[in-house]
Interface confidence: medium
């Protein structure tokens, strides 16, 4: 789902982020990170090339910006070896994945969109939220977001469709 469905970040709302406890991943999430790492650790050395950090992150559904990538690589590859260990990769991904929404937060967000309480997010609902967040999106872009999530083709996004697109990647 594109930007209209994302909650505003602390930076964009001008809020100060509270000091949070050290983020932790579940065993399931750690396994997912391990799978992505192993895809690029072709020689089984326990390291991946720093230049493969972006594609490994992409395999986990993240699309880091160029500046963000540079910063991450300099943080994890301090010696400049061009190699990243699994523990370093896990540290990066723990930070990224802990920022992702939980199911409860996703449903809370759904209810914010569904202000008329129809049980579905309509084009009108989406446009209202986009305007409130100051998102400069065209009607075509907003409709694309609806279409992307709308599995049953009724032109609106129900709770199940919203959860699915926020939680899981899918060709369809």
């Amino acid at each position: 789902m594109a930007s209209g469905f994302k909650k505003p970040s602390a930076a964009s709302t001008g809020q100060k982020r509270k000091v949070a406890p050290k983020p932790e991943l579940t065993e399931d999430q750690k396994q997912e990170v391990r799978e992505a790492f192993d895809l690029f650790d072709v020689d089984g050395s326990g390291t991946i090339d720093a230049k493969e950090l972006k594609v490994a992150m992409r395999a986990l559904g993240f699309e880091p910006r160029k500046e963000e990538m540079k910063k991450m690589i300099s943080e994890v590859d301090r010696e400049g070896t061009g190699k990243i260990s699994f523990n370093d990769f896990l540290a990066v991904m723990t930070q990224k994945m802990s920022e992702k929404d939980t199911k409860e937060e996703i449903l809370k967000a759904f209810r914010l969109f569904d202000d008329d309480e129809t049980g579905k997010i309509s084009f009108k609902n989406l446009k209202r939220v986009a305007n409130e967040l100051g998102e400069n999106l065209t009607d075509e872009e907003l409709q694309e977001m609806i279409d992307e999530a709308d599995r049953d083709g009724d032109g609106e996004v129900n709770e199940e469709e919203f959860l699915r697109i926020m939680k899981k990647t899918s060709l369809y």
């Epitope: 997912e32 559904g61 049953d152 083709g153 009724d154 032109g155 899981k168 369809y172």
Partner: antibody, heavy 113, light 107 residues
Framework: QVQLQQSGAELVRPGSSVKISCKAS????????MNWVKQRPGQGLEWIGQ????????DYNGEFKGKATLTADRSSSTAYMQLSSLTSEDSAVYFC??????WGQGTLVTVSA | DIVMTQSHKFMSTSVGDRVSITCKAS??????VAWYQQKPGQSPKLLIY???TRHTGVPDRFTGSGSGTDFTLTISNVQSEDLADYFC?????????FGGGTKLEIK
């Protein structure tokens, strides 16, 4: 590149069970739905169900509830389908497919006394 | 369950021709329709999804169209390698269902 390697052909007795596997490679196994499809000789395609390996979430075609059980082992990036109480109607080629964009080569199951 | 009907079990065409394979859904499925090609002894291959979006690597002679209940897969400038079975599928609601297939024969 994405590859799905299915287990070999099975010849099984009526009333027994069979478990077929689909080993995935070339992508993060946990993040994509794995579908299973049945095709009887010279026939069309029937959707059995799907599993999301990331959390084990499943959806089944009602016709296959009680017949097929879908599981996934993330540590080996392998999806499994167990078919129980087999009859001649279950003789078919079974395909696994990652969201229908990538397909395994198929596993032939023959039920015969 | 939604029934997908491919009224032509067989279609005959010549190399270089244009052929249209049709599929009808028993109820409105929006544009949640995919098309597959299956050659003898092979796995199905995704050609089209969302009724008209061509899958990566699929030649542009394959075109999908339609919405609601009526869908068409058109193959223009048919090649001998297009000899295959073609299936439509709806993924608008569970259970996902496939059409019975259309076998394309080359004269």
């Amino acid at each position: 590149q994405v590859q799905l390697q299915q287990s070999g052909a099975e010849l099984v007795r009526p009333g027994s069970s069979v478990k077929i596997s689909c080993k995935a490679s070339g992508y993060v196994f946990s993040r994509y739905w794995m579908n299973w499809v049945k095709q009887r000789p010279g026939q069309g395609l029937e959707w059995i169900g799907q599993i999301y390996p990331g959390d084990g979430d499943t959806d089944y075609n009602g016709e296959f509830k009680g017949k097929a059980t879908l599981t996934a082992d993330r540590s080996s990036s392998t999806a499994y389908m167990q078919l129980s109480s087999l009859t001649s109607e279950d003789s078919a080629v079974y395909f696994c497919a990652r969201e229908f964009a990538y397909w395994g080569q198929g596993t032939l199951v023959t039920v015969s006394a | 369950d939604i029934v997908m009907t491919q009224s032509h079990k067989f279609m005959s065409t010549s190399v270089g021709d244009r052929v249209s394979i049709t599929c009808k859904a028993s109820q409105d499925v929006g544009t949640a329709v995919a098309w597959y090609q299956q050659k003898p002894g092979q796995s199905p291959k995704l050609l089209i999804y969302w009724a008209s979006t061509r899958h990566t690597g699929v030649p542009d002679r394959f075109t999908g169209s339609g919405s609601g209940t009526d869908f068409t897969l058109t193959i223009s400038n048919v090649q001998s390698e297009d000899l295959a079975d073609y299936f439509c599928q709806q993924y608008s609601s569970y259970p996902y269902t496939f059409g019975g297939g259309t076998k394309l024969e080359i004269k």
